[in-house]
């Protein structure tokens, strides 16, 4: 059973999570962006069902992609470099979802823009946070 | 049709700089990024690193990193490529490509024909 | 960065037989939200721009020969030339166009026997 400071320590990370995504869906929705046209024509892959902290599978597997978008806007809209931003989300996602978890993602049929796939995943992050507190 | 047309053969001392310019047309310089690839005579091809020209940002090979500038003149439908403190190994042809669309940056569908720079003393 | 690792160096086939060039990714090129691997081939003729042939690792590029295809997923791919024919005569080239940087392979020669 979760003791109440592995609890907490879970909700240190999700919450850390959020800031980073929010981070990143703040710098691209900045106005000065010039790049969130282009930005919106990338595909973006959301998982069926994130209800649980294995479902961050699914979001491990689209980061490399969101670092590929990142980049296009890499030094106007964010204080870390893409590679650094989404390494830092990396760790924490493999944190909170266990190295040793081979749940498969099953993926949804219909396409987000990124600023869709940042939200769901932003609202992931709430969400089960709000079952920790 | 998409069309890139690239500046004439350099020959060049080691220690100074070259710069390549490739032309876009049958569409809109500013839809799309370009890139920039390199091949050593009898060698592989190497990606040194692309620019947007709707705004100038830049992503540059680590390798290439200090060395290369790329520019673009949108009024011109043209992009640059400068490549600084040459030496005898940047000895290359050098290429600019656009991606086969703009939704995934890679890969390379249309290609210049391509520019001979010797380095030579 | 993704090594690729192309194989053979080069390959001597005659005519109208099968040619198979093979290409190693340090790093699986599968994307499992799409199911695509992005991976492509290149044809590359002396004093020619490399030529686009197949993206996604099995997607035929427009205008491109159909006795081209591609196959493969993950970390393992093919290019297959089902007939040769004189103007197949070329370099080919993998490229892995997932991650910055794209890198590509060293190539392989495709003579006639």
């Known amino acids: 059973a979760p003791t109440s400071s592995s609890t907490k320590k879970t909700q240190l990370q999700l919450e850390h999570l959020l800031l980073d995504l929010q981070m990143i869906l703040n710098g691209i929705n900045n106005y000065k962006n010039p790049k969130l046209t282009r930005m919106l024509t990338f595909k973006f892959y959301m998982p069926k069902k994130a209800t649980e902290l294995k479902h961050l599978q699914c979001l491990e597997e689209e980061l490399k992609p969101l670092e590929e978008v990142l980049n296009l806007a890499q030094s106007k809209n964010f204080h870390l470099r893409p590679r650094d931003l989404i390494s830092n989300i990396n760790v924490i996602v493999l944190e909170l979802k266990g190295s040793e978890t081979t749940f498969m993602c099953e993926y949804a049929d219909e396409t987000a823009t990124i600023v869709e796939f940042l939200n769901r995943w932003i609202t992931f992050c709430q969400s089960i946070i709000s079952t920790l507190t | 049709q998409v069309q890139l047309v690239q500046s004439g053969a350099e020959v060049k001392k080691p220690g100074s700089s070259v710069k390549v310019s490739c032309k876009a047309s049958?569409?809109?310089?500013?839809?799309?990024?370009i890139h920039w690839v390199r091949q050593a005579p009898g060698q592989g091809l190497e990606w040194m690193g692309w620019i947007d020209p709707e705004d100038g940002e830049t992503n540059y090979a680590q390798k290439f990193q200090g060395r290369v500038t790329l520019t673009a003149d949108t009024s011109t439908s043209t992009a640059y490529m400068e490549l600084s403190s040459l030496r005898s190994e940047d000895t290359a042809v050098y290429y600019c490509a656009r991606s086969l669309d703009s939704t995934w940056i890679y890969p390379f569908a249309y290609w210049g024909q391509g520019t001979l720079v010797t380095v030579s003393s | 960065d993704i090594v690729m690792t192309q194989s053979p160096d080069s390959l001597a086939v005659s005519l109208g037989e099968r040619a198979t060039i093979n290409c190693k990714s340090s790093q699986s090129l599968l994307r499992r939200g799409n199911q695509k691997n992005h991976l492509a081939w290149y044809q590359q003729k002396p004093g020619q721009p490399p030529k686009l042939l197949i993206y996604?690792?099995?997607t035929g590029q427009s205008g491109v020969p159909d006795r081209f295809s591609g196959s493969g997923s993950g970390t393992d791919f093919t290019l297959t030339i089902s007939s040769l024919q004189a103007e197949d005569v070329a370099v080919y080239y993998c490229l892995q166009s997932y991650i910055t940087p794209p890198t590509f392979g060293a190539g392989t020669k495709v003579e006639i026997k």
């Open positions: 049958g569409y809109s310089i500013t839809d799309d990024l």
């Open positions: 996604d690792a099995s």
